[in-house]
Every structure is written in C-alpha cells, then in structure tokens.
Interface confidence: medium
C-alpha cells in the first residue's frame, strides 16, 4: 500500500515520540518490578501491549514512561511507590541498553533518535506522588521527571480531577489552590512539562492561563468527538493552539468512540478534529498502551503506529503535518519549557498550610513554629 | 485570599464622565490582570478592559476603545477606570476582577480571555438625563 510505504519512510526519518505508555505498571504488577524475572524479558514480553520487537515495529524513537502510583496511595505510600516505578525505568534502559537510552532533554531525544535508540524520558502519572511537597517535586525532578501529570482520577489538596466535571468529585481548589499555583510555577522554573491529562477543565483553564510555558496533555482526545470527559473541550483546545501547546492524542476506546469498540479510522477523527481547532502544531500521539483494557481495532500495539500515519496520509496530511505529530510537536514544546526555566532562580519555598494537607499519620515538624 | 472593593459609581448625564476604583487587598502583583466588567439588566457579564499587573498589557472591549482608559498604581493597590463620553448604554453594575495569569499567557491571549477567580461585589453606574 503506497500510504503504508510513505508512513515508513517518514518514520525512518522521524520516528514516533509517544506521551504516555504503562509498561512500568505491567512490570510491578506482573512481576513486582522484578526484571529478571524470565517471563520479564522484554524482548519476547508477551501479554502486553508494549515489548522490544513491537516498539522496533512501531517506529517508536521515543517513549515518556508513565510512573503510576494509584489514588489509593495518597496520604499512604504514594512517594514510595513513585521512587519504586521510576527505579524500574532506570533499571529497564540500563538493562537493554541497546534498545534503551534513558534521556531528561530534548537534546537527549535528537541523540537518541541519532543512535537508532528509544529515547526514554519519565513522566509522573498524578500530582498526589509529590505529597504536597515542592521538596519531593524538586527531588523527583532531580531523579529525571520531565512531566508531572497534575493530578490522576482524583484530587490532590491542590488541583482537581476529571472527575469533578463527571460530578463523581467535589471540586475543592476551583482549578489550582494558591500551592497549585506554587507547584506549577516550581514547574515551569525546573523546566518539567506540565500535563493536564486526567484534570479538569477549570484546572486545564488555570494552567494554561498561568503557565510560563506551554504545557501537554499527554493521553486525552477530543471532547467534541467523544464526550468523555477525560477529553479536552473545544475552547480549551482554543487555549492550547493561542499558547502553543500539544494535546497528544489517546487511543482507549470508550475515550474515542465512547464505547467499548473503536477503531482506527475514529483516531484519525480525533487527531483531525484537534487539527482543525487548534492547528498541525498542536497534535501528538499518546496512546496510553498498557495501561487501558481496549484499544482499537487497527491499533492493537505499539507496533501498529505506521497504520495510523497511513490513514492521516491518505486524508491529505502533509509529511510536514505528520512529522509535527510524530517528534516535531513535541520537540518544540519541550524545547520552549527549556528556554523558559530559570534554575537560577530562587525555588519556591512556601509549604502547603498545615490545614490543607490531607492524610492522618503525619508529623507536624516545621509547622509549629 | 484577594479582596476586591470597587468604588465610584453613581448617576452621569450622557456625555459625563466617572472614575472607578477598585483596592484590591495586597497580594503579589506578579502573574495577575486586574479586570473592570459590566452587567446591565437582563444581560450576561460582559468584558470591559483589564489590565496586566506589570501593566504591560492592556485590552479594551470594541464597545469602549477610546472612550474608557485603564490604569493602575501598584504602590496602593488600585486600578482605576476613567470612564468618558458616557452613554446611556453604559448603565449597568461594574465589577472588578483578578486572574492569576502569567506574562506568557497575556502575551498570547490578552487578558478579557482570562478566568477570573476574585470578584468584587460591584457598583451601579446609571446614564440618564
């Protein structure tokens, strides 16, 4: 097929970078990150969305790893557990370190992509993983978090979920609370991508209104194409094309055609939809691979991304528009959250109020001066 | 949490003209607009002019250019609307608001776009012979 053949051909050039993939999460849950565990070799992984010869498959030059630590963990172990989950990243790039070249850069990316490798970078999956803590933000950033997903399917002290426009939470920050307005400022100093995946809309609006620098969702589609309300609404979409930042798009079913069938001819709906709202510029791919139970026919793994540049080709995207989508987007993103940290600049250092802190086995050093 | 209290408001013949204020509490005046918006009878809110904290950006709705001036004085905390060549459509209840927005935001969006998260509780203004 002559559009799978074009697909290919820019994708030697210009591999796939994806926002957001669950591989870490599968290895703690079937192996309790335990990587030599011999079912764990990911060269013949089976049972997963994601493995060696598919991502090699799939074109994928770059991949942000989803540290995940579940809502259950807040106030408990959630900063444990988020230690632990970004540990395997480092040990899984160090152990197949041909497939694997762990990154924090965008330069980092480029070399990657020079040296045929994944580039490999860290996302933290839900603000509850810092603890209310610019200390743990500023450690976890030290450890290689290069985006920080602000909140997961539930509120933090300071930012509010998706959930809250389901009318499954109550909101408790209309948006982001004076320390979410401190965590994102903190963020924008050390040069760590914003995510306003799984958020709601009065916290994408804040973020993108107070943000220094563009900002992405890393896993949410297009709200007017599937009204999930994990999908971005067409005026917040008017947001992310004024303040140039990038809505990579998600793959799971009932977020694309709001059922549990989807296909991939519905994808390419919802990458154009974002097109046409908020321009080339501001389209990615975020899969979401293992961390979902249904993805659509046609996108069955990481290895089925050179369908999906086929069927944009065959719409009449152009190469530059498909290249956007594929690195370029994001590279220019990342790039522009670089040039506009500050790490010169005095941190931030106001804690969150005692009052505010959730959680009931808590020591209260520092506050009771 | 930021206080906004607006004052004078009153009665104007058409063509007159009205200086509001609004003191705001103090707060870092880093990442905030400071905006004036109106509300007539039977009407939704609607954006009249805003104003960077840094006042380097400033924005006007099409309805007001040239008639309404904004300007701030950070050293007291106010941000006052001098308000000329009024006209009886003019008349409705204004309102000061704040948003947290950052330079970057402005820069690509202007400050009428921005949610406002603090409101005053308003003043009437009335054009009429």
């Known amino acids: 097929d002559f559009f799978r053949d074009e697909a290919e051909r820019i994708m030697r050039d210009s591999p796939v970078i994806d926002g957001h993939n669950d591989l870490p999460w599968q290895l703690l849950d079937m192996f309790n990150n335990r990587l030599q565990d011999e079912r764990a070799n990911l060269t013949t992984l089976a049972g997963t969305h994601t493995n060696i010869p598919k991502l090699r498959a799939g074109f994928v030059g770059g991949q942000f790893w989803s540290v995940y630590t579940p809502c259950d963990t807040q106030n408990k172990d959630a900063v444990r557990r988020t230690l632990e989950q970004m540990d395997v990243v480092h040990r899984m790039c160090r152990m197949y370190p041909e497939t694997f070249l762990y990154v924090t850069s965008s330069a980092g990316i480029r070399q990657a992509f020079r040296e045929g490798k994944v580039a490999s970078l860290i996302g933290v999956e839900g603000g509850h993983s810092i603890d209310s803590s610019l200390g743990v933000l500023r450690a976890l950033y030290q450890l290689g978090m290069r985006y920080l997903t602000l909140t997961h399917s539930c509120n933090t002290p300071w930012a509010d979920n998706w959930l809250v426009d389901t009318g499954d939470s109550e909101p408790q920050s209309q948006g982001l609370s004076p320390f979410g307005q401190r965590v994102v400022k903190e963020l924008n100093r050390l040069g760590v991508l914003i995510d306003l995946a799984h958020v709601s809309v009065a916290t994408m609006k804040a973020t993108l209104q107070l943000s220094r620098a563009p900002v992405i969702f890393s896993h949410s589609s297009a709200y007017s194409v599937c009204a999930s309300r994990r999908n971005v609404p067409d005026d917040v979409l008017r947001l992310v094309k004024q303040t140039d930042s990038l809505v990579m798009v998600n793959f799971y079913n009932n977020y694309i055609s709001c059922t549990n069938k989807a296909n991939l001819s519905q994808v390419a709906d919802h990458l154009d939809h974002i097109k046409e709202v908020a321009g080339a510029r501001a389209v990615g791919f975020g899969g979401d691979f293992d961390g979902v139970p249904r993805v659509p026919e046609g996108l069955e793994d990481v290895s089925k991304y050179p369908d999906l540049i086929a069927e944009l080709l065959r719409r009449n995207w152009t190469e530059a528009e498909v290249k956007g989508a594929l690195a370029d987007n994001l590279l220019r993103v990342f790039e522009a959250v670089e040039q506009a940290s500050n790490l010169t600049q005095a941190p931030e250092e106001e804690p969150i109020p005692l009052d505010q802190l959730g959680g009931s086995c808590r020591t209260h050093y520092g506050y009771s001066s | 949490e930021v206080q906004l209290v607006e004052s004078g408001g009153g009665l104007v013949q058409p063509g007159g003209s009205l200086r509001l204020s609004c003191a705001t509490s103090?707060?870092?005046?880093?990442?905030?607009?400071i905006g004036w918006f109106r509300q007539a009878p039977g009407k939704e809110r609607e954006g009249v002019s805003c104003?960077?904290?840094?006042?380097?950006?400033?924005n006007y709705a099409d309805s007001v250019k040239g008639r309404f001036t904004i300007s701030s004085d950070n050293a007291k905390n106010t941000v006052s609307l001098q308000m000329n060549s009024l006209r009886p459509e003019d008349t409705a209840v204004y309102y000061c608001?704040?948003?947290?927005?950052?330079?970057?935001?402005?820069?690509?969006?202007?400050?009428?776009?921005?949610?406002?998260?603090?409101w005053g509780q308003g003043t009437q203004v009335t054009v009429s012979s």
């Open positions: 103090e707060f870092t005046l880093d990442y905030y607009a």
């Open positions: 608001a704040a948003a947290r927005v950052s330079a970057y935001y402005l820069g690509n969006y202007g400050c009428l776009n921005a949610e406002y998260g603090y």
């Open positions: 104003i960077s904290s840094s006042g380097g950006t400033t």
